[in-house]
Interface confidence: medium
């Protein structure tokens, strides 16, 4: 991973999180330079043989591609030349989290940068008055999770309060064995109030909010990945 | 079937020199990394050498640093592991094993014996 | 280099038991673990990389968890056919390194 010459370039990255199963980007910038043919963009990975991904004289060069990658990655071809080295990666696996370095070589010199990269599932809850129970109550779902979230109940009026002893949350595998859904239920609920739902994990936090009044139902929800630092 | 066959092992004395290669079938050995790990009469396993998918990337333990040399032909689908200098303690089953997830596919093993 | 080192060294269980291996490394190695059975005269096989991501085809009554330095190997339900010798491996780096193993025997 070390580099040698005389001549360094800043090279920049963002760390982020990738939802398990869908596209993510790894984000990488550097100083461009104006010939394409002279940049080169190699992606490597903390506990892996080969690259992730590799970028010379215009074109992907996959021949050292390591076989968990292969198929997955892209960078954006035509930013490169204005300095964008980021990694798409398709299908985001659990275990494409961990440490990666994007390398950067051009006419200027040579640099790089670390990212730290997680992986889980998070998805936007969704709250709902539940007419099937026998009093007010409140149901809250999520259906794509990890690792496995906690989830706190609060409300406008009860500011501090505590819902704990009034909600009951449970967790459901889903199909793939990995991810799990979020139902997370609140009994005794007021009328003319706005009551939140919040989920959380270690790679992000969702909210969302239900208002309940005589006349109408008004909902909002929030999703925001957490630790995302340049 | 995806399968790993090593051969070339046997009794050497302690200085000479033996080629190990592992045939891969089954799957398309130029796309996978492969490592070689040994395990000495009544011990654990210990990681020897590993290569990537085209050679660019090889690394060795440092108990083997100098003494031995992995490579591979794509074309005809083998690992191989030449080792000069060899010593008592090479002594070892020796297996070569595909670079997955972990090392998910291994050949049954080949056993070399280093001893005058 | 990354030590491995595993515990118990062996040990004894009947059919049915639950059975817990650790594997502790001598210094965070994140999730870069797995781990792999073995029986005499036979090559290793992986059941769990990833620390915690069970191999295709092996029975589910295998789990693995940890992460950093202290990781666990578990057997929900021992069988006849799981009595061997059990390794963990980190791959965060170079040197690749196992643990020294744990040799589950009949009681």
């Known amino acids: 991973f070390g580099i040698s010459g005389r001549h360094s370039i800043t090279v920049t990255t963002v760390a982020s999180a990738g939802n398990i199963g869908e596209d993510g980007i790894l984000s990488c910038t550097f100083e461009p330079d104006i010939k394409l043919s002279d940049i080169v963009i190699q992606w490597l990975k903390e506990g892996v043989l080969g690259l992730v991904h590799e970028f010379k004289e215009g074109k992907d060069e996959l021949s050292e591609q390591d076989e968990m990658f292969r198929g997955r990655t892209a960078v954006f071809a035509d930013q490169v030349i204005v300095g964008n080295a980021s990694l798409r990666l398709k299908n985001v696996q659990l275990t494409d989290a961990g440490t990666y370095k994007c390398y950067i070589i051009t006419s200027k010199g040579k640099g790089n940068a670390n990212l730290e990269y997680k992986t889980g599932a998070f998805s936007m809850p969704e709250v709902n008055v539940d007419y099937n129970a026998s009093s007010e109550t409140l149901r809250c779902e999520a259906p794509r999770w990890f690792p496995q979230p906690t989830v706190v109940w609060a409300s406008q009026v009860d500011q501090g309060a505590n819902f704990s002893e009034v909600s009951n949350t449970s967790f459901e595998l889903n199909s793939e064995n990995v991810t799990m859904k979020v139902v997370s239920v609140l009994y005794n609920v007021t009328i003319n109030n706005t009551y939140s739902c919040m989920i959380e994990n270690d790679i992000a936090k969702a909210t969302g909010d239900i208002k309940v009044t005589e006349s109408e139902i008004k909902r909002r929800s929030h999703l925001q990945l957490l630790n995302s630092k340049a | 079937e995806v399968q790993l066959l090593e051969s070339g092992g046997g009794l050497v004395q302690p200085g000479g020199s033996l080629r190990l290669s592992c045939a891969a079938s089954?799957?398309?050995?130029?796309?996978?990394?492969m490592h070689w790990v040994r395990q000495a009469p009544g011990k654990g396993l210990e990681w020897v050498a590993s290569i990537s998918s085209s050679s660019g990337y090889i690394y060795y333990a440092d108990s083997v640093k100098g003494r031995f040399t992995i490579s591979r032909d794509n074309s005809k689908n083998t690992l191989y592991l030449q080792m000069n200098s060899l010593r008592a303690e090479d002594t070892a089953v020796y297996y070569c094993?595909?670079?997955?997830?972990?090392?998910?596919?291994w050949g049954q093993g080949t056993t070399v014996t280093v001893s005058s | 280099d990354i030590q491995m080192t595993q515990s118990p060294s062996s040990l004894s269980a009947s059919v049915g038991d639950r059975v817990t291996i650790t594997c502790r490394a001598s210094q965070s190695i994140r999730s870069y673990l797995n781990w792999y059975q073995q029986k005499p005269g036979k090559a290793p096989k992986l059941l769990i990389y990833y620390a915690s991501s069970l191999q295709s085809g092996v029975p589910s009554r295998f789990s693995g968890s940890g992460s950093g330095t202290d990781f666990t190997l578990t057997i929900s339900s021992l069988q006849p056919e799981d009595f061997a010798t059990y390794y963990c491996q980190q791959y965060y780096s170079t040197p690749l390194t196992f643990g020294q193993g744990t040799k589950v025997e009949i009681k």
């Open positions: 094993a595909r670079a997955s997830s972990g090392m998910d596919v």
């Open positions: 089954g799957f398309t050995f130029s796309s996978y990394g």
